[in-house]
């Protein structure tokens, strides 16, 4: 019962995680304009993996897709690739795990096959989650680097009084969605791997049978056979370390009802 619950919960958590990874990948707010000392802005810029947008205070929002492949930064391409790989692996993992669920009966599928499928989907979820976390972390690192670079030359003087304000970008909502979603997928994958161990039949013990020969009283006791599942109780649990970059919590300041500029 506990195994079924662990497997079911692992599936649900992974499903939510993968939905989150898909949502994060599609979101436009991977990076948003840093409002630093100006919480109210007439022109608000934000960017996603696929397009950049500008929201004007007048009510108009204009989004433009990145219609070039070669002209994009390699890091952005890498993040796109990581997120897509994460989605694909996660989707395959979900498909496999549906058939592996203990509560679903498909023909005469043995528990050993279900255990194998559960482990496979679990590993896929773990890799999917790691891909998402890695993708989001790479993007976040890229933002932090650019943020400090643009801070260094925040105001470039032109003829004394004229100023050019450089737009700085900070973490967008998609990053947090991606981190959480990646974490959930990872946790779901670990739960599937744990459930797999419970699904695998450990050993089959045959009760001793006595055969009475007519002349001699000889008892024949066949030895207990261990089912060869490949998932013995000696399987070591390897710790998976997440080396994702950590940043201080950022306080997003939103425009209040009455802003004076």
């Amino acid at each position: 019962m506990a195994v079924t619950a662990c497997q079911g919960l692992g599936f649900v958590v992974s499903l939510i995680g993968i939905a989150g990874i898909i949502a994060a990948t599609c979101m436009d707010q991977w990076s948003t304009q840093d409002l630093y000392n100006n919480p109210v802005t007439a022109v608000f810029n934000y960017q996603g993996l696929w397009r950049s947008c500008v929201r004007e205070s007048s009510g108009f929002t204009e989004c433009r897709g990145y219609f070039t492949l070669l002209g994009l930064p390699a890091m952005l391409q890498a993040v796109r690739a990581l997120m897509i790989v994460g989605i694909v692996l996660g989707a395959i993992g979900l498909l496999v795990s549906i058939f592996a669920l203990k509560c679903i009966r498909i023909g005469s599928m043995e528990d050993s096959a279900k255990a194998n499928m559960t482990l496979t989907s679990g590993i896929m979820f773990i890799v999917s989650g790691l891909c998402a976390i890695a993708g989001v972390s790479v993007f976040a690192n890229m933002l932090v680097t650019n943020f400090w670079m643009s801070t260094a030359n925040m105001y470039t003087g032109m003829g004394g009084m004229v100023q050019t304000v450089q737009t700085r970008y900070t973490f967008g909502a998609a990053l947090f969605v991606g981190w959480v979603a990646g974490g959930l997928t990872l946790i779901g994958g670990v739960m599937m791997c744990i459930a797999c161990r419970g699904l695998a039949p450990e050993e089959t013990n045959y009760k001793a049978v006595s055969y009475h020969a007519s002349g001699h009283s000889v008892a024949y006791k066949p030895g207990g056979f261990k089912a060869s599942t490949g998932f013995g109780s000696n399987t070591k649990n390897k710790k998976i370390y997440d080396g994702g970059a950590r940043t201080e919590d950022e306080v997003q300041s939103y425009p209040s009802k009455h802003d004076y500029v």
Partner: antibody, heavy 118, light 113 residues
């Protein structure tokens, strides 16, 4: 077509308050901001503030802090501006304007003349 | 606040002449997000509300004659009337739409000789 119909001229005494209205029609009212602009006779234009009808968010010019307050009634698609503690300096034509691309003002009301006189 | 400075303050022209008026901002009006300049031009005739001519520094508002052309980037902008006509006599204002508070130039008054 987009129309902004403003209330009629006002003659008020110094120290009093006045409420100007701006009735919008011909477009989705909550999708665009409403701005208010002041123009003194024979002078330039001064932006007072803006209101975004969808969430009621307001942004004011610091120069008009305490002088003007913007409100909205989405059910009647009408925007209001209250002007407080009026002085002769507040005698002007006040325009309500709908925002457009580039934070420009494409649609202007006909203007309301406010005269502050004892 | 961004200060908008228009020059000249008044301009006397003859019919069918080419007119150039300038607007300078104290800060760049260029937005890197969409590569656009948030500068607007208006025309105001006596006793009327201002009329939008140009937004995003160079995009002509629908219904505006093509003799009106906006140009410039960053802090320096120009409104050109290729062949001025009698109905163009008015005051022309430029406006910053890049940051709050929105600010207007003092205006350029176009007069006929």
């Amino acid at each position: 077509q987009v129309q902004l119909q403003q209330s009629g001229p006002e003659l008020v005494k110094p120290g009093a308050s006045v409420k100007l209205s701006c009735k919008a029609s011909g477009y989705s009212f909550t999708n665009f901001d409403i701005n208010w602009v002041k123009q003194r006779p024979g002078q330039g234009l001064q932006w007072i503030g803006r209101l975004y009808p969808r969430d009621g968010t307001t942004t004011y010019n610091e120069k008009f802090k305490g002088k003007a307050s913007l409100t909205v009634d989405t059910s009647s698609t009408t925007s209001y501006m209250d002007l407080h503690s009026l002085t002769s300096e507040d005698s002007a034509v006040y325009f309500c304007v709908r925002g457009n691309y580039g934070n420009s003002f494409a649609y202007w009301g006909q203007g309301t003349l406010v005269t502050v006189s004892a | 606040d961004i200060v908008m400075t228009q020059s000249p303050s008044s301009l006397t022209v003859t019919a069918r002449e080419k007119v150039i008026m300038n607007c300078k901002s104290s800060q760049s009006l260029f937005n890197s997000g969409n590569q656009k300049n948030y500068l607007t031009w208006y025309q105001q005739k006596p006793g009327q509300s201002p009329k939008l001519l140009i937004y995003w520094a160079s995009t002509r508002q629908s219904g505006v004659p093509d003799r009106f052309t906006g140009s410039g980037s960053g802090t320096d902008f120009t409104l050109t009337i290729s062949t001025v006509q009698a109905e163009d006599l008015a005051v022309y204002f430029c406006q910053n739409g890049f940051s709050f508070p929105y600010t207007f130039g003092g205006g350029t008054k176009l007069e006929m000789n």
